[in-house]
């Protein structure tokens, strides 16, 4: 059975040129964490694998920082980078929990983080 | 040319065991995961486990825990499937396959398979 | 555990026919894999993550579907098509395919 929740850091703004860190969490499982993918709508940004390591997609390789921890960095953002993000944790033996991140990319310099809020 | 090798079929009494080989050729052993599929006569596909010969670590099917135990030789880039306590449940095909690790391709290779018939 | 179903367990089609072959899951998943098995062989790998085709694949099988509903469809059947087509699923442990679409040439 599934008992996990996922926190992550909610809808975010951030300015033109700047950087994001996108985090998720996992609680509430005594779960193993066997691999987090990062996805930007179905597109493939990164991969975190316990037993393997890192991995970036080789066209955000320029722009996608690993780290930290289970967590991803946005580099040298663009208006194009708004949207939808998910955290895709597969777990053993639960299974596959996701999260999702609002990232709205501002021209101004008035970029405000909001609010935490949980997933289960 | 990417390679599963399996080793050949095994006629083995009930109540013994049996340890099957799975002998990796074209890619780095420690770059993928193995995973073990059982195929019973004119039945589908059943998964055993996954297995990192890097580390060791093993996800396996609660059903087989204390049924198979894998091990790999990186050495040889071999991995090997232990069958214990044979019954006649336990006549099958089974195959070893490498997964894609970033989850893009599911098992992407596999051995040839290597037939157990349990018998007195 | 995620229990996928497969419908029809047996189907036979002639060539130039449309086939669709569905896997329904028991719980929603992420994605789909699917996989071609003919007798004596070892599976192949036939279509990951839903919708696209493994190496070698023809282009007129095509994969879609999301949550608890999947399927893999050849849009003209052609002789070489004849196999058991398998789902799979990655979204939980443990690992499960479904039991199988035996498809056979009319």
């Known amino acids: 059975m599934m008992t996990g929740t996922i926190e992550t850091t909610g809808n975010i703004s951030a300015e033109k040129g700047g950087s994001i860190i996108l985090q998720c969490h996992l609680s509430s499982t005594t779960a193993q964490v066997t691999q987090v993918n990062w996805e930007q709508q179905d597109q493939l940004l990164a991969i975190c694998n316990a037993d393997l390591g890192w991995h970036i997609s080789p066209s955000f390789k320029d722009r996608v920082a690993p780290g930290p921890g289970l967590g991803l960095t946005l580099q040298s953002l663009t208006v194009n980078d708004t949207g939808e993000y998910f955290c895709i944790y597969h777990t053993y033996p639960d299974g596959t929990y996701t999260g999702r991140i609002f990232l709205e990319v501002l021209e101004s310099s008035v970029a405000e983080h909001g609010a935490r809020f949980q997933i289960p | 040319d990417i390679q599963l090798k399996q080793s050949g079929a095994e006629l083995v009494r009930p109540g013994a065991s049996v340890k099957l080989s799975c002998k990796a050729s074209?890619?780095?052993?420690?770059?993928?995961?193995i995973n073990w599929v059982k195929q019973r006569p004119g039945q589908g596909l059943e998964w055993i486990a996954r297995f990192y010969p890097g580390s060791g670590n093993t996800y396996y099917n609660e059903k087989f825990k204390g049924k198979a135990t894998l091990t790999a030789e990186k050495s040889s880039s071999t991995a090997y499937m232990q069958l214990s306590s044979l019954t006649s449940e336990d006549s099958a095909v089974y195959f070893c396959?490498?997964?894609?690790?970033?989850?893009?391709?599911?098992?992407?290779?596999w051995g040839q398979g290597t037939t157990v018939t349990v018998s007195s | 555990d995620i229990v996928l179903t497969q419908s029809p367990a047996i189907m036979s089609a002639s060539p130039g026919e449309k086939v669709t072959i569905s896997c329904s899951a028991n719980?929603?998943?992420?994605?789909m894999y699917w996989y071609q098995q003919k007798p004596g062989s070892s599976p192949k790998p036939w279509i990951y993550?839903?919708?696209n085709l493994a190496s070698g694949v023809p282009a007129r099988f095509s994969g879609s579907g999301s949550g608890t509903s999947y399927s893999l469809t050849i849009s003209s059947m052609e002789a070489e098509d004849a196999a058991t087509y398998y789902c799979?699923?990655?979204?939980?442990?443990?690992?499960?395919f479904g039991a199988g679409t035996k498809l056979e040439l009319k």
């Open positions: 074209g890619y780095t052993f420690t770059d993928s995961y």
């Open positions: 799979q699923q990655y979204h939980s442990y443990p690992l499960t």
């Open positions: 993550r839903t919708s």
């Open positions: 396959a490498r997964e894609a690790w970033l989850l893009f391709y599911g098992m992407d290779y």
């Open positions: 719980s929603s998943v992420s994605y």
